[in-house]
Interface confidence: medium
């Protein structure tokens, strides 16, 4: 399964911070960065860095300390940018992350200094089963971006 998350401040549940996505092993979490056609909003485009953090970092929406891992940067608001995280128990890649069944992982975005964005938060709950099929389950929508 591919679970698509449109990561932008038009997504009410990401804003509130109580969005939950349930993923199984071998699923993919696809993060779609904000995208603008033309000049973008008057307050400027949303650009940010996405981090995986621990619970205190999620609560405070702060990506600091040894348990904050920068995963991606959405810094090209006029391009089509998407990142993917494979939910797997073991990873062959040095930049990959290993996910344990039954655990919850926390993602936050920290706006860049020049950005109009707000703090956005997502909880990823990893379930137990390995899945083989592929279909899409988006969270959020392209919204205004």
């Amino acid at each position: 399964l591919r679970h698509v998350v449109y990561w932008n401040s038009s997504n009410p549940r990401l804003l509130r911070g109580d969005a939950v996505v349930e993923l199984g092993l071998n699923d993919y979490l696809d993060i779609v960065c904000p995208h603008y056609e033309g000049p973008g909003p008057p307050e400027g485009p949303e650009t940010f860095a996405l981090y995986m953090v621990d619970w205190p970092g999620y609560e405070s929406c702060q990506a600091e300390g040894p348990r904050a891992y920068k995963r991606w940067v959405c810094s090209l608001p006029f391009g089509h940018v998407q990142f993917s995280e494979k939910i797997q128990r073991f990873t062959p890649f040095s930049l990959g992350f290993e996910f344990l069944p039954g655990e919850t992982y926390y993602y936050i975005s920290v706006p860049t200094p020049e950005s109009s964005g707000q703090c956005l938060r997502l909880q990823v709950s990893v379930c137990c089963k390995e899945r083989k099929s592929e279909s899409a389950h988006p969270v959020g929508s392209p919204g205004e971006s």
Epitope: H3, N11, R13, L15, R16, G17, D18, S60, H137, S141
Partner: antibody, heavy 112, light 107 residues
Framework: QVQLKQSGPGLVAPSQSLSITCTVS????????VDWVRQSPGKGLEWLGV???????NYNSALKSRLSISKDNSKSQVFLKMNSLQTDDTAMYYC??????WGQGTLVTVSA | DIVMTQSQKFMSTSVGDRVTVTCKAS??????VAWFQQKSGQSPKPLIH???YRYSGVPDRFTGSGSGTDFTLTITNVQSEDLVAYFC?????????FGGGTKLEIK
Amino acid sequence: QVQLKQSGPGLVAPSQSLSITCTVSGFSLTTYGVDWVRQSPGKGLEWLGVIWGGGSTNYNSALKSRLSISKDNSKSQVFLKMNSLQTDDTAMYYCASDWAYWGQGTLVTVSA
Amino acid sequence: DIVMTQSQKFMSTSVGDRVTVTCKASQNVGTNVAWFQQKSGQSPKPLIHSASYRYSGVPDRFTGSGSGTDFTLTITNVQSEDLVAYFCQQYKRYPYTFGGGTKLEIK
């Protein structure tokens, strides 16, 4: 334009079950979570539960034994079913998409 | 369950005034608090999330603040259409719970 429209019976007899349908437009149910809330003069606003885009649910533990939330993505419909209604279940029942968009409400009266 | 207490069921104010609606949580909820406005006969409308962030389209005369257990919704330059009910909600823990509401009335 996001809209949620509710349909369901206005009057339910005690001990019977309640079914309300929330039909959404302007977005896909695989996109956002949908919460159910009820409001009564006695209990105020009370969160009943949520169904997430992927289909998983969370319920208010006080009502979990008689509450069920399900959906049909292809028909853009979310269903609330509550069993064994009593008079204190009389309330306005709302569906809400990610708290930003709300249905118009369904007034449910439990009475013989 | 976390209890959200809005101690004032009614508050009197005048158009142009500044009014502060309070909400107290029975335990620490961080900043996982939202505020809703409800006009008579209508569904609740979200105003504030994460204790202090306005939703898009909400006038800037509405300001939320607080963290932990004490939260406020401040309305500056109150307009006649603001004389309705306001509810706080915590979403730190299931079940999500609401305050009993505060209705603004004309002095």
